[in-house]
């Protein structure tokens, strides 16, 4: 919306934001950081939720893909008055609650959590936060942490999926704007195209899935190509190779002409899926074509 790089991935994005007393004079910077970042996720299949935590976790905006609701959610976010303790685990609980309810629906959409905090978590609170982040992961979430000012990077590396999933902002809140590009690059998992996009009915093929972020998985051995055929049956295939910008996958043999397979990618062995608008279609191929 405001130019620059964007993310076309279809997944559920949760912002878990510290609104404890220590961010009182920096809430504007946190808000603008979220607002700028939110506008860069532009897939119509992307849903977003805003969660804030202090002495308890609050779901300020429930998961939605409705851009008008997201605009209203951002307005609510701007009005937040920080205060209270840093009970980060309560924020993770509120994300897990939504993921759990959504997962019951059958189809599991991939979840990405971006958690922002500004201080060191004291022993118990760190233990609880790590525990709740693990629960979110058990439900299929990828967890990123943004640490501002007096954060403990070792702690955040254990709350996030890994050290590579932590974004340290050492120069204070005003420097948050400077990491938007790198967060977008790392947290965005998107499917942009498939080559070929048309395959011969009844024949075996390999498909190159073009996109970004395929190596952001905690374990690249758990990456799967998934083909949702005619909006009903889903077939998962293990890729031959996984690179950050492409996957090489065996395509399922689709027997009939005109069948459509929507392309999805799982980063966690089929626990949840990144959706896309990329479709592979079957056509009739005469001998020798």
């Amino acid at each position: 919306e405001d130019g620059g790089p964007a993310c076309y991935g279809g997944f559920d994005l949760y912002f878990i934001l510290d609104k404890s007393g220590s961010v009182l004079h920096h809430w504007n910077e946190i808000y603008y950081f979220v607002e700028q970042l939110a506008h860069k996720f532009i897939s119509p299949q992307l849903r977003m939720s805003f969660i804030v935590f202090s002495t308890r976790g609050t779901t300020l905006m429930k998961l939605t893909e409705d851009r008008e609701q997201i605009r209203q959610g951002l307005e609510e976010l701007q009005k937040v008055l920080p205060g209270g303790d840093t009970y980060m685990h309560e924020g993770f609980e509120r994300a897990s609650e939504q993921i759990y309810y959504e997962n019951r629906q059958g189809y599991r959409t991939a979840s990405v959590i971006i958690a922002l905090t500004d201080g060191e978590l004291h022993e118990d609170l760190f233990f609880y936060s790590e525990r709740e982040a693990n629960r979110s992961r058990d439900l299929g979430a990828i967890v990123y942490c943004v640490g501002v000012k007096d954060f403990n990077e070792t702690q955040l590396a254990r709350i996030a999926d890994s050290k590579d999933h932590v974004f340290p902002v050492n120069d204070g809140f005003q420097a948050l704007q400077g990491i938007i590009h790198s967060i977008l690059k790392k947290s965005c998992i998107e499917i942009l195209a498939a080559e070929p996009s048309t395959i011969c009915a009844g024949e075996s093929f390999q498909v190159v899935v073009r996109g970004n972020g395929f190596r952001h998985a905690r374990n690249v051995d758990r990456v799967l190509c998934s083909f949702k055929i005619n909006d009903s049956v889903t077939l998962n295939e293990k890729p031959f190779s996984v690179e950050d910008t492409y996957l090489l996958c065996p395509a399922p043999i689709l027997k009939e002409v005109g069948m459509k397979a929507a392309l999805q990618v799982s980063m966690n062995d089929g626990l949840s899926f990144i959706s896309s608008s990329v479709i592979i279609t079957t056509t009739h191929c005469s001998d020798g074509s």
Partner: antibody, heavy 117, light 108 residues
């Protein structure tokens, strides 16, 4: 099919103890949190206690904290509620329920606990 | 913590739409679940996460949640829908689940 069956209810005197059990079948027991919810005669539902899937984490309503203990044996697919220092106001039908983030999607048929002298 | 308030009773004619409310401060920030309980039976989940219907629950049951009020709507109410209905919400691990006082639905 998915089923929860409670047992162990009965008549007990004030100050006494009782242990409720809930036998589960038809689902992967160790993948779910579980809860006890009670209902006093003619009254509404009241959450009592929760336990995580591996039994590591337990939570209690203020009204029973320090008196009730929730536990589970995943090898036996069974949930327990140990109730001590029972009071007249603990009289209720006790239900066990499969739980996740406050959502109770499967319930047992309930077992009646009566605390009276 | 959140407190949930329900009307003690609601009456509806067969085939009409029944609406049962559940109110609480900033309830829209919480997810609301609804349970149906018939006399002598255990509760049954009919709506969860504000508006999601578990498999096996008829389409006439729907839910919504905005502002300070969540609503369970039963369109084309049938005699078999006569029961007590409870709303509930999860207040987090520390506080557990909160239930509304329950609403007795009478189908006239």
């Amino acid at each position: 099919q998915v089923q929860l069956v409670e047992s162990g209810g009965g008549l007990v005197q004030p100050g006494g103890s009782l242990r409720l059990s809930c036998a589960a079948s038809g689902f992967t027991f160790n993948s779910y949190g579980l809860s006890w919810v009670r209902q006093a005669p003619g009254k509404g539902l009241e959450w009592v206690s929760n336990i995580s899937s591996n039994g590591s984490y337990t939570y209690y309503a203020d009204s029973v904290k320090g008196r009730f203990t929730i536990s589970r044996d995943n090898s036996k697919n069974t949930l327990y509620l140990q109730m001590n220092s029972l009071r007249a106001e603990d009289t209720a039908v006790y239900y066990c329920a499969r739980a996740g983030y406050g959502l109770f999607d499967v319930w047992g048929q309930g077992t009646l606990v009566t605390v009276s002298s | 913590d959140i407190e949930l308030t329900q009307p003690p009773s609601v009456s509806v004619a067969p085939g009409q739409t029944a609406r049962i409310s559940c109110s609480g401060d900033k309830l829209r920030e919480y997810y609301v679940h609804w349970y149906q309980q018939k006399p002598g039976q255990a509760p049954v989940l009919v709506i969860y996460g504000d508006n999601k219907r578990p498999s096996g629950i008829p389409e006439r049951f729907s839910g919504s949640n905005s502002g300070n009020t969540a609503t369970l709507t039963i369109s084309g109410t049938q005699a078999e829908d006569e029961a007590d209905y409870y709303c509930s919400s999860w207040a987090g691990s520390r506080s557990g689940t909160v239930f509304g006082g329950g609403t007795k639905l009478t189908v006239l």
